[in-house]
């Protein structure tokens, strides 16, 4: 239950650098797990508690996006031709997008076990957690699923596909007032 | 171990610009975020804003934008928080905390504070 | 913004008393909140860290509990040590605020 999860990352207190430090234990371990679903409705299933998106900051998070992430997944797709992949997952407005990032982004697949590691997924995460309210709480609630990340990180077809589907979705929610195709 | 060290006390007058800095060490620099947080002479605790080297982007709070920059030196693990225009109201303790970005979500690490003196 | 007020502004207790303390947050924020100890010429010190949960180092004696509006810090039986500022503090949204402060004082 939740009190193993909160068990398993306990903090310690210390003292240093004249100021105060309390390190979190097993911090790289806390991660999250949950159901490979789609919805249209800005929800994410998360056990009983459906995240909400639709009061993040679309505009930072767009702001990340363009700065950063977007060049993280086209270094993930290098050597990768744009049209090798069709994109078969769609969203309907902001909120809707963010569901299906966060799914495809964190939610194992077949064939494409964990992409939670990528430098993408990590500032992915990072965005959700400072600009839609109550993410990072839902996040520490979470099961503790990703694992400390392999030496080597394999990159299946079924990753690239999966990460090709990533940015069509970010496209897409950079461009909400385009009416859906 | 983690450590959170902040440059010394500083005296400013009024209408001037004072920049503190924030050295980390311990820990992965891109993995929290740097918050700044001030404290006024017995009065509480005020969030100022955020860098995030991660993001390579801060957030403000509306109270300090345009006055307050917060910026960070990946490469030697250190943040800064400007303030500028800065009047006595201003004289308070800074502080800079971690906060994790990825996992545990909290202020678990502060530095030491550094005092600002705003004086004519 | 989201204001948290705290209350009672000041607590007088005696040693070995229990001590609860409220935050109040102006808009629910689930469990989104956290607690500080900072003693003079300190800086704050973590305790409790959303809402309930315990932090290894930090004696026992110290618990939260509460979610959406209401939350509070509890000291079982307080020591010498205890006397100083607790603040709450809320990391739902941004711009993350802290409460007005409780100062446990000696009775």
């Known amino acids: 239950g939740l009190n193993d999860i909160f068990e398993a990352q306990k903090i310690e207190w210390h003292e240093g650098g004249g100021g105060s430090e309390q390190k979190l234990i097993s911090e790289e371990d806390l991660g999250s797990s949950h159901h490979h679903h789609h919805h249209s409705s800005g929800l994410v299933p998360r056990g009983s508690h459906m995240y909400d998106f639709t009061n993040c900051d679309f505009e930072k998070i767009k702001a990340a996006y363009l700065s950063t992430i977007s060049k993280d997944l086209i270094t993930y797709m290098s050597g990768t031709k744009s049209t090798e992949f069709n994109n078969t997952v769609s969203c309907s407005n902001r909120p809707h997008c963010l569901t299906e990032i966060q799914s495809l982004t964190f939610n194992p697949t077949a064939g494409c076990a964990s992409l939670a590691k990528e430098m993408f997924a990590m500032k992915t995460k990072a965005a959700l957690a400072i600009w839609c309210p109550g993410y990072s709480e839902t996040q520490i609630n979470a099961t503790q699923a990703m694992k400390k990340a392999r030496k080597s990180k394999v990159t299946t077809n079924k990753c690239l596909e999966q990460v090709s589907q990533l940015q069509g979705l970010w496209r897409r929610f950079n461009r909400p007032l385009l009416k859906q195709q | 171990q983690v450590q959170l060290v902040q440059s010394g006390p500083e005296v400013k007058k009024p209408g001037s610009s004072v920049k503190v800095s924030c050295k980390a060490s311990?820990?992965?620099?891109?993995?929290?975020?740097m918050h700044w947080v001030r404290q006024r002479p017995g009065q509480g605790l005020e969030w100022m804003g955020t860098?995030?080297?991660?993001?390579?982007?801060?957030d403000y709070n509306q109270n300090f934008k345009g006055r307050a920059t917060i910026t960070a030196d990946k490469s030697t693990s250190t943040a800064y928080m400007e303030l500028s225009s800065l009047r006595s109201e201003d004289t308070a303790v800074y502080y800079c905390?971690?906060?994790?970005?990825?996992?545990?979500?909290?202020?678990?690490?502060w530095g030491q504070g550094t005092l600002v003196t705003v004086s004519s | 913004e989201i204001v948290l007020t705290q209350s009672p502004g000041t607590l007088s207790l005696s040693p070995g008393e229990r001590a609860t303390l409220s935050c109040r947050a102006s808009?629910?924020?689930?469990?989104?909140v956290h607690w500080y100890q900072q003693k003079p010429g300190e800086a704050p010190r973590l305790l409790i860290y959303f809402a309930s949960q315990s932090i290894s180092g930090i004696p026992d004696r110290f618990s939260g509990s509460g979610s959406g509006t209401d939350f509070t810090l509890t000291i079982s039986r307080l020591e010498s040590e205890d006397f100083a500022v607790y603040y709450c503090q809320q990391t739902f949204s941004l711009p993350y605020t802290f409460g007005t402060g409780t100062k446990v004082e000696i009775k």
């Open positions: 860098f995030i080297p991660l993001l390579d982007t801060s």
């Open positions: 808009q629910p924020i689930s469990i989104s």
């Open positions: 311990g820990y992965i620099f891109t993995d929290y975020a």
């Open positions: 905390a971690r906060m994790g970005v990825t996992h545990s979500y909290v202020m678990d690490a």
